[in-house]
Interface confidence: low
Amino acid sequence: AMDLILINSLPLVSDAETSLTCIASGWRPHEPITIGRDFEALMNQHQDPLEVTQDVTREWAKKVVWKREKASKINGAYFCEGRVRGEAIRIRTMKMRQQASFLPATLTMTVDKGDNVNISFKKVLIKEEDAVIYKNGSFIHSVPRHEVPDILEVHLPHAQPQDAGVYSARYIGGNLFTSAFTRLIVRRCEAQKWGPECNHLCTACMNNGVCHEDTGECICPPGFMGRTCEKACELHTFGRTCKERCSGQEGCKSYVFCLPDPYGCSCATGWKGLQCNEACHPGFYGPDCKLRCSCNNGEMCDRFQGCLCSPGWQGLQCEREGIQRMTPKIVDLPDHIEVNSGKFNPICKASGWPLPTNEEMTLVKPDGTVLHPKDFNHTDHFSVAIFTIHRILPPDSGVWVCSVNTVAGMVEKPFNISVKVLPKPLNAPNVIDTGHNFAVINISSEPYFGDGPIKSKKLLYKPVNHYEAWQHIQVTNEIVTLNYLEPRTEYELCVQLVRRGEGGEGHPGPVRRFTTASIGLPPPRGLNLLPKSQTTLNLTWQPIFPSSEDDFYVEVERRSVQKSDQQNIKVPGNLTSVLLNNLHPREQYVVRARVNTKAQGEWSEDLTAWTLSDILPPQPENIKISNITHSSAVISWTILDGYSISSITIRYKVQGKNEDQHVDVKIKNATITQYQLKGLEPETAYQVDIFAENNIGSSNPAFSHELVTLPESQAPADLGGGKMLL
């Protein structure tokens, strides 16, 4: 969630001013960013503390500026560090004298485990001395004075992570001040692999993006963004969402960008050279100008963005026909949300093309925790990610960030969440009067602990010795009468306060007990099986009162209709429900129950129910349009069982009219399979769509149906469902 960028301007120090700027783009750190000397990489560098200042041009940025007279103290290795959730992200870079005897080919070099590596330094000063090479400040290699080549190389066959570090080259008579540095980064995994065991295949990172060996995500070069780094930023912008801008006259010229490992450092797109002050030659683009344009159809090559594709073409070489990609946009997200502590299901909604997928949408908490959607659906124009926080608490208040990262680019939107403490009465309710089937209660709802205002109040009650759910009634007055109670039964009472907003039900307050007067008992009855969620069904029944004193229990057998899966559950006799869990979504289950004592009881009739669907419903089938008159028509259809279809929508409009001039008929009883459209215009062509809705969303019609009403005098006609491809 942290987009940390270190700008090294300039790494080769001459007599000009030089600086390091560390930017935490689009991120609000709890702990400050630090810039320091990297003694891990070079132990014997200058010890002077750095003068770190706030970069006034950016909200979350620190800067170190060296004036020209301090040039002698600059050589060495540096880091910028940001911390999130106690975890440090450290970016490393180096500065060296432009007048050094050798200069590195690149400031950093990233290789994969197992690669054959050549680290090279160019000789810029000829001396009659041996050349020496160090790694992290320790001697590793020397070249006799008469054999020092123009290009000094360190060859590392089959590179391993332990080969990583800062390599420096100088003549033996020199010192740190005359040393050249390059840092080798060795990815923990072999090429195109990531993961703890390096057995996952990396996403193809384009435009010289680098696959992170721990996450599999692409680290995009400055000037590119998105899940695969395919999307070019606007001119002179950088950062994970391209929100940061190079303020120089020539954009990002003379800025060396260093990103978290394993990326290392590079120029922004369009620039090359150790100082990033050389423009790309024609036909080349990207960071360090390493990418070659091979644009199809004679398209233009831009040194910053690569091939500039004509409308209807896309891809790095404009090689693919297709709808132009659109950077995602986060929509309908308020700047401030007040939520109640407890379960919270924030929603992130985004547009773009292609539409963001489940994996491409995340939510970042103020402490940096990255949440992934628990539920996801999309329409033609939007993707909706639903996140689940099982228990949100007041310390979770603060700035949350909705983040969307697709091949078409990346966008982040911060929003403020204020978490409220749920109210709870401090006192138990008082019982004023009781009978055999009623009680008069003073609910004593105030004073209470937690946040108001109180929207509503509930009085909860249940028999003490029955393991049944609490019943409740909404109350407006402090005095309330409870009716329909069981005789000779001890009850528990408590009050629950509800504040505004979803999940505003506070924890019930202290409990009061009382007992009703005596009278006879009713018999038990009523098995009921209902879906609770995609993986649970709830079986309920009325309390059981056996005639004998024998111990008893309820045996519940559930089996899947589709799979070879049966489970028997033993439920204590004093319970009146059981939650059948660990089920599969969109699956039909058959349940039966019996009451067992020492002998087994008789099984009940089978009850059947489907778990809720985990996918969009299929389109209604067998769609027919019949009985067409001048002003009406009958539409019939069938739907597939098992998709938790709750309603059918018929959408119709006059052919050729605007999309928004349609009429929606929502049929909330999914068992209805035909509908008469009335009030139609004579001799008019209508476009008719029909789709199904369930707990996940709506089905997607592939075709529209055409309906043409008759002239006023003509007899009804049948139309076998003429299809018009949308």
Epitope: R559, S564, Q566, Q567, N568, I569, K570, N582
Partner: antibody, heavy 119, light 107 residues
């Protein structure tokens, strides 16, 4: 009364073949799964294979995969175990057992038939 | 495959004793465990299914408990006809696998 009666066991040489039968009665044959479970002399129980007579779905233990074939004839309420390329380690009492409704516990077992693989 | 490990492999007890046999699965098998009794030369008989359910016709002195990886068969008061070998079996995944057996002998 539910009954499972195995037959077809006997002495066979290594590499030979044998076909076991399991005649079922007293229950709806196609509404249950039928398994073969074996027990080498003095050893524990080892599941071998199972079939759903209704749709012909079959599953095998790795130790017999490719050598044994389980089948069922719903018209005769009989399950079969065709055993090819027999080895000495296949010597065992072979039981036919019923999984009622689903392949979970074995609620009825046959009396077993002995298969001896020896030269 | 899921391994089912029974202990002890054998035990000696007297009529009237309370006997406990345990079975451990190599991974979570929920309550998909059955217990069988086998006497020499006979086919196994189902005693307990789904970890704790007494199969029809089985005396109530037999009981089962457990879920996840640890399961127990208890005979509350051992009777002469209970001397036999007992097997646990998981049916959580294919292949179903059995424990190696526990032989209950007369002391």
């Amino acid at each position: 009364e539910v009954q499972l009666v195995e037959s077809g066991g006997g002495l066979v040489q290594p590499g030979g073949s044998l076909r076991l039968s399991c005649a079922a009665s007293g229950f709806t044959f196609s509404g249950s799964w039928i398994s073969w479970v074996r027990q080498a002399p003095g050893k524990g129980l080892e599941w071998v294979a199972r079939i759903n007579p209704y749709d012909g779905n079959t599953y095998y233990a790795d130790s017999v995969k490719g050598r044994f074939t389980i089948s069922a004839d719903t018209s005769k309420n009989t399950a079969y175990l065709q055993m090819n390329s027999l080895r000495a380690e296949d010597t065992a009492v072979y039981y036919c057992a019923r999984n009622n409704r689903f392949p979970t516990w074995f609620d009825y077992w046959g009396q077993g038939t002995l298969v001896t693989v020896s030269s | 495959d899921i391994q089912m490990t029974q202990s002890p492999s054998s035990l000696s007890a007297s009529v009237g004793d309370r006997v406990t046999i345990t079975c451990r699965a190599s991974q979570d098998v929920s309550t998909a465990v059955a217990w069988y009794q086998q006497k020499p030369g006979k086919a196994p008989k189902l005693l307990i299914y789904s970890a704790s359910f007494l199969y029809s016709g089985v005396p109530s002195r037999f009981s089962g408990s457990g879920s996840g990886t640890d399961f127990t068969l208890t005979i509350s008061s051992l009777q002469p006809e209970d001397f036999a070998t007992y097997y646990c079996q998981q049916s959580y995944t294919t292949p179903p696998t059995f424990g190696q057996g526990t032989k209950v002998e007369i002391k």
